[in-house]
Interface confidence: low
């Protein structure tokens, strides 16, 4: 049988960075300022994202790609494509509705984002605590008590916790 040939859509010839302008007899027109088209054959250009306020521009908008934002100092990205900026906290803290709060005893957070997580329970793996946990650091599990030589201590004092931002001296 003979295949019917469909007429080619004239808009399919319009490359990224242009749009198929119905007002101009489907001529490919460049995207106006502050807009883009990332694929060919588009009948409109999309408005560029603007990185305002707590957002700052990581990549400028071009005729073929949207702007990309990241967050100003003190905030970090959340969501696909950095759709939100969330306040940073210090290590040893988590963000609550009332702001940054220290981790409760028995929990830690070694990052400037996220929630405080419980210290590892070494005994569940038959091990003992080798280094105590802090607000900023998880415990370090060591060998099981049976593996320790007589007289050996199962706990060593924790290393001094560093404020985030400090470099090792």
């Amino acid at each position: 049988f003979e295949r019917t040939r469909s007429l080619q859509d004239p808009c399919s010839n319009c490359p990224a960075g242009t749009f198929c302008d119905n007002n101009r007899n489907q001529i490919c027109s460049p995207c106006p300022p502050n807009s883009f088209s990332s694929a060919g054959g588009q009948r409109t250009c999309d408005i560029c994202r603007q990185c305002k306020g707590v957002f700052r521009t990581r990549k400028e908008c071009s005729s073929t790609s949207n702007a990309e934002c990241d967050c100003t100092p003190g905030f970090h990205c959340l969501g696909a494509g950095c759709s939100m900026c969330e306040q940073d906290c210090k290590q040893g803290q988590e963000l609550t509705k009332k702001g940054c709060k220290d981790c409760c005893f028995g929990t830690f957070n070694d990052q400037k984002r996220g929630i405080c997580r419980p210290w590892t329970n070494c005994s569940l793996d038959g091990k003992s605590v080798l280094v105590n946990g802090t607000k900023e650091r998880d415990v370090v599990c060591g060998p099981s008590p049976a593996d320790l030589s007589p007289g050996a201590s199962s706990v060593t004092p924790p290393a001094p916790a560093r404020e985030p931002g400090h470099s090792p001296q």
């Epitope: 700052r56 521009t57 990581r58 990549k59 400028e60 990309e68 990241d70 967050c71 100003t72 100092p73 003190g74 905030f75 970090h76 306040q87 940073d88 906290c89 210090k90 803290q93 702001g99 940054c100 990052q111 400037k112 985030p164 931002g165």
Partner: antibody, heavy 121, light 111 residues
Framework: EVQLVQSGAEVKKPGASVKVSCKAS????????MDWVRQAPGQGLEWMGN????????NYAEKFKSRVTLTVDTSISTAYMELSRLRSDDTAVYYC??????????????WGQGTLVTVSS | DIVMTQSPDSLAVSLGERATINCRAS??????????MHWYQQKPGQPPKLLIK???NLESGVPDRFSGSGSGTDFTLTISSLQAEDVAVYYC?????????FGGGTKVEIK
Amino acid sequence: EVQLVQSGAEVKKPGASVKVSCKASGYTFTSYWMDWVRQAPGQGLEWMGNIYPDSGGTNYAEKFKSRVTLTVDTSISTAYMELSRLRSDDTAVYYCAREEALGGYYELTYWGQGTLVTVSS
Amino acid sequence: DIVMTQSPDSLAVSLGERATINCRASQSVSTSSYSYMHWYQQKPGQPPKLLIKYASNLESGVPDRFSGSGSGTDFTLTISSLQAEDVAVYYCQHSWEIPYTFGGGTKVEIK
């Protein structure tokens, strides 16, 4: 060891352009913002702008927006600062400096040695 | 833009004595967690060197006679016991927003 090595001194005539390079080594070039700061003779430090090598995204101080272009060549871990329509008051030492961007904090931890650009007729 | 105002412009201090440099921002550069204020030292013919970050955190390798304090709009760099090698120009800088700006600098000399 992080190192930023800049191109040599330049003498230019008013109205000309200059392109200063900054070759980075000792770290992942694409992962850190690179800033440009200038210092006129006997004067203070003036922030010009920065570029994120991974995406080519830039920020410029308003004063320099129309005359400065920041670019990178990631294949050779090099950042460039081009200043056009030079005037005599553009005579300065131009520094590249890498931001310490871990966790979203931005201090200028590593600096190039500086490139003296002299604009004179 | 945030304007950074440093004082004094210059400072002459005897060896072993305390030197204090102030920096005021035209708006707050602090959150509840951090102050986005940094201090740099620049000696003649050299690039600036980071001394203090986030108002009070000493950069690695910097002698502990240097210290920083303050939050909001007012910040201080202190050299507790001035040494000959501390003769330099000191700059404050904020990283609160684009554009970053520097203070005008304070020249520290030996009396």
